[in-house]
Amino acid sequence: QKSSIEKCSVDIQQSRNKTTERPGLLNCPIYWQQLREKCLLFSHTVNPWNNSLADCSTKESSLLLIRDKDELIHTQNLIRDKAILFWIGLNFSLSEKNWKWINGSFLNSNDLEIRGDAKENSCISISQTSVYSEYCSTEIRWICQKELTPVRNKVYPDS
Amino acid sequence: QKSSIEKCSVDIQQSRNKTTERPGLLNCPIYWQQLREKCLLFSHTVNPWNNSLADCSTKESSLLLIRDKDELIHTQNLIRDKAILFWIGLNFSLSEKNWKWINGSFLNSNDLEIRGDAKENSCISISQTSVYSEYCSTEIRWICQKELTPVRNKVYPDS
């Protein structure tokens, strides 16, 4: 007699064969906070931007990607202390002379009002109230994200 | 009448409430190759190491972490062309003067026989036959990994 979970594995596997859908997260892992269709993890330790990116990656997640001003505000509402900074997945691309998300897309200039310089070795952090350009070597906290809902036919081409 | 998949969501969610287990991958997403308890994605495009790390992260995966010589050999067996290099999740930490995996652990010197220098801005690539130290700015292919099996009580403390 199979448990319901074992039966689920079979059901989902058969479903995936038809739809090429990967299971996705059904709800957020322990310690992660749900914000709409994402799970967010706010670090308690500090790291430069690069190490923060690596940490999210080893957690099979991404440094936070913010779609629009609305998502920024909702994320900032989860930050308790006004002075604390958190890395997100946005840094300055010297070759393209533009702010670039780690998924390869460029910042829509209307989305975030960045305080500070757009220059080499600059990465973006958010606080409870603002968005700042900081040296990427600065050691601050960071936010990882996981997509919560499974997406049908979600595939992973190269960026 | 709920579909079997909808019922599964409920079953798995109830199960997770008891076990703090996150669903995990039941099998590999399309385009990913299974190697034991991992899913691997071999890129077809090229990138410097940092961009490769970012790409894996946005795919909610990690640059390849290799546990031991055995896993290295099995991974290399999946590489078809002798001349092609792939970034993995290992680079040189200048402050600690040592090879460091992106999960924060240091390389066990017996695990990989690295050809090339251990110095600033050096990152590790693998080919079908060898392990090389390359400038991190070198644009080559890369390998992302996802853990395949759900791990009970898997939590994500800061690195």
Epitope: T45, V46, A83, I84, Y135, E139 | -
Partner: antibody, heavy 122, light 108 residues
Framework: QVQLVESGGGLVKPGGSLRLSCAAS????????MSWIRQAPGKGLEWVSY????????AYADSVKGRFTISRDNAKNSLYLQMNSLRAEDTAVYYC???????????????WGRGTLVTVSS | DIQLTQSPSSVSASVGDRVTITCRAS??????LAWYQQKPGKAPKLLIY???SLQSGVPSRFSGSGSGTDFTLTISSLQPEDFATYYC??????????FGGGTKVEIK
């Protein structure tokens, strides 16, 4: 309890050297930016140097650049200031200070030691 | 370098008085400003950070305001233990992290 204790101050001749130490306890030292700040007798406060949590990033005030070296040993919960080529104008109480966590290089000093007096005189 | 000018340099006040100290930056520093209290022979103590956030354990009679170049520290009702020297400090991400010249609050 949470505290910082400086040591190593004293009387030194111009051109001489001193090494200040700061012992931290009661908090996770390796997660904080640490600084040295000084105060000349009867004067205001002057930031001297900072070091990032990992020790990878360091900065100095122009007045001490090339003469002072900041360092840390996270395993020993200790901060250091090596002072060379000392001048009369370096005479001051030297404070070790911790910055609020996770504000990066925006250094708000939320914990201070009691200070150690350095006197440079012939 | 960013200069901070505090005024007044000293103020005489009585217990229960409302005291206001201002700090002006030579260029805009957003909200990257702190206020400290220092008593003779003691280390400074952080009162306010991020221009208006009250540091843990600091009495609510202390408050900070301002943004850009002009900032204010207010003590709503002066207590005997508040007689001290007060310093502002700018903490933009670029060193040096300059302090104001100080304001001495004395007993009238």
């Amino acid at each position: 309890q949470v505290q910082l204790v400086e040591s190593g101050g004293g009387l030194v001749k111009p051109g001489g050297s001193l090494r200040l130490s700061c012992a931290a306890s009661g908090f996770t030292f390796s997660q904080y930016y640490m600084s040295w700040i000084r105060q000349a007798p009867g004067k205001g406060l002057e930031w001297v140097s900072y070091i990032s949590p990992s020790g990878a990033t360091i900065a100095y005030a122009d007045s001490v650049k090339g003469r002072f070296t900041i360092s840390r040993d996270n395993a020993k919960n200790s901060l250091y200031l090596q002072m060379n080529s000392l001048r009369a104008e370096d005479t001051a109480v030297y404070y070790c200070a911790r910055s609020l966590m996770a504000t990066g290089t925006h250094l708000y000093f939320d914990l201070w030691g009691r200070g150690t007096l350095v006197t440079v005189s012939s | 370098d960013i200069q901070l000018t505090q005024s007044p340099s000293s103020v005489s006040a009585s217990v229960g008085d409302r005291v206001t100290i201002t700090c002006r930056a030579s260029q805009g520093i957003s909200s990257w400003l702190a206020w400290y209290q220092q008593k003779p022979g003691k280390a400074p103590k952080l009162l306010i950070y991020a221009a208006e956030s009250l540091q843990s354990g600091v009495p609510s009679r202390f408050s900070g305001s301002g943004s850009g170049t002009d900032f204010t520290l207010t003590i709503s009702s002066l207590q005997p233990e508040d007689f001290a020297t007060y310093y502002c400090q700018q903490v933009t991400s670029q060193p040096p992290y300059t302090f104001g010249g100080g304001t001495k609050v004395e007993i009238k």
